[in-house]
């Protein structure tokens, strides 16, 4: 039959950050190729990465439909080579994912600190809020806009002079800090989702970026414009 | 001998329905996987669908997806396109084809229904 | 989408000369693992529904004269007619199988000068 000599895929992982969803399996494929399938609990399957050789599919289309249902992916393993010698009345293997919540379990990008501006005693530092491939009418949201305030900013500063960090937090993407005048300064932030008891409540830390030498300099750090 | 027969075309309004089925016979259909491809007057060549041997799964092209249902019943020999909010962009030859050495090289095609979408 | 781009829209040529179709992918065609091209071609007569000529981009079909030929790997593909034939006044297209969705390139018609 077609069916024997392919094998179930296995180790099916979802590796996704800021909404992008990537359904990764093994092994790698000899002598047969992979469909995929998605589905919400309530859903029909819908079939992804039809006859694909590779061990991953980029599930992100279907997954921003509804960030906040849960999802199912299954692979199939198909004979490849020869279709009249591999063809076959069996089902094909398959195996099924864990099952995957986007809103709760997407990682959370690295943020980058857009600006930061010193006005005497205070500091301005804004957080470049990032664009996700979630869409509402046409138009794609940013994280903030689909997390709201669920998701909140962690600030780390410190004197360029010394290693003793202080904290600061925000529910937006702007944070308003006291310094010491005449002191350098050097910021690095953090997006979380307090509300998350899992290990991906957190991101990783931005890029740390550090303030110029001279006296009340606002310093910009780049903005990036997106284009989708 | 291998044989693909469409049936089914026919004039239709736009955002009508229509259902094309396409009878094989002379090889063991329900171990090929079979699909639709059109063909506009005058014009080239679209792939449609794909529906795999067992009917597990099906794949759309972007045109078509949301409006076309392929699907196929293994005891009769029959594979189906259920065609749904029909465009007058829909209007053209459907053919059914199966898989030949490959996924996706076909090596038989019916003949083709017409499908003419128009008020 | 992988893009199947072919050239010329028409093509005329005196029976017994030859006669070249090119296809270009907008991405490789060729799968690195079994080193094999996944494309087809075919020819589609007058009122008659396509036939393939040839897949894996150079193995000819069972029962196609040994005067058409396929070449090319990756992006670029050529079909060869070595000596055209009054049979062989059709369209013809190249296919990639590669990926789907499968696409077509916009044909080429091969007419008699």
């Known amino acids: 039959s077609g069916t024997t000599n392919t094998v179930a895929a296995y180790n099916l992982t979802w590796k996704s950050t800021n909404f992008k969803t990537i359904l990764e399996w093994e092994p790698k494929p000899i002598n047969q190729v992979y469909t995929v399938q998605i589905s919400t609990k309530s859903g029909d399957w819908k079939s992804k990465c039809f006859y694909t050789a590779d061990t991953e599919c980029d599930l992100t289309d279907e997954i921003v439909k509804d960030v906040k249902q849960t999802y199912l992916a299954r692979v199939f393993s198909y004979p490849a080579g020869h279709v009249e010698s591999t063809g076959s009345t069996e089902e094909p293997p398959y195996e099924n994912s864990p099952e995957f919540t986007p809103y709760l379990e997407t990682n959370l990008g690295q943020p980058t600190i857009q600006s930061f501006e010193q006005v005497g005693t205070k500091v301005n530092v804004t957080v470049q809020d990032e664009w996700t491939l979630v869409r509402r009418n046409d138009t794609f949201l940013s994280l903030r806009d689909v997390f709201g305030k669920d998701l909140i900013y962690t600030l780390y500063y410190w004197k360029s002079s010394s290693s003793g960090k202080k904290t600061a937090k925000t529910n937006t993407n702007e944070f308003l800090i006291d310094v010491d005048k005449g002191e350098n300064y050097c910021f690095s932030v953090q997006a979380v989702i307090p509300s998350r008891r899992t290990a991906n409540r957190k991101s990783t830390d931005s890029p740390v970026e550090c303030m110029g030498h001279e006296k009340g300099e606002s310093r910009e750090t780049g903005h990036h414009h997106h284009h989708h | 001998q291998v044989q693909l027969v469409e049936s089914g075309g026919g004039v239709v309004q736009p955002g009508r329905s229509l259902r094309l089925s396409c009878a094989a016979s002379g090889f063991t259909f329900h171990s090929r996987g079979m699909h639709w491809v059109r063909q506009a007057p005058g014009k080239g060549l679209e792939w449609v669908a794909v529906i795999t041997y067992d009917g597990i799964n099906k794949y759309y092209a972007d045109s078509v997806e949301g409006r076309f249902t392929i699907s196929r019943d293994n005891s009769k020999n029959t594979l189906y396109l259920q065609m749904n909010s029909l465009r007058a962009e829909d209007t053209a030859v459907y053919y059914c084809a199966r898989d030949g050495v490959y996924y996706g090289v076909y090596d038989y095609w019916g003949q083709g229904t017409l499908v003419t979408v128009s008020s | 989408d992988i893009v199947m781009t072919q050239s010329p829209d028409s093509l005329a040529v005196s029976l017994g000369e030859r006669a070249t179709i090119n296809c270009k992918s907008s991405?490789?065609?060729?799968?690195?693992?079994?080193?094999?091209?996944?494309l087809a071609w075919y020819q589609q007569k007058p009122g008659q529904p396509p036939k393939l000529l040839i897949y894996?981009?150079?193995t000819r079909e069972s029962g196609v004269p040994d005067r058409f030929s396929g070449s090319g790997s990756g992006t670029d593909f050529t079909l060869t007619i070595s000596s055209l034939q009054a049979e062989d006044v059709a369209v013809y297209y190249c296919q990639q199988f590669h990926s789907y969705p499968l696409t077509f390139g916009g044909g080429t018609k091969v007419e008699i000068k």
């Open positions: 894996w981009a150079s």
């Open positions: 991405q490789s065609v060729l799968f690195s693992s079994n080193n094999k091209n996944y």
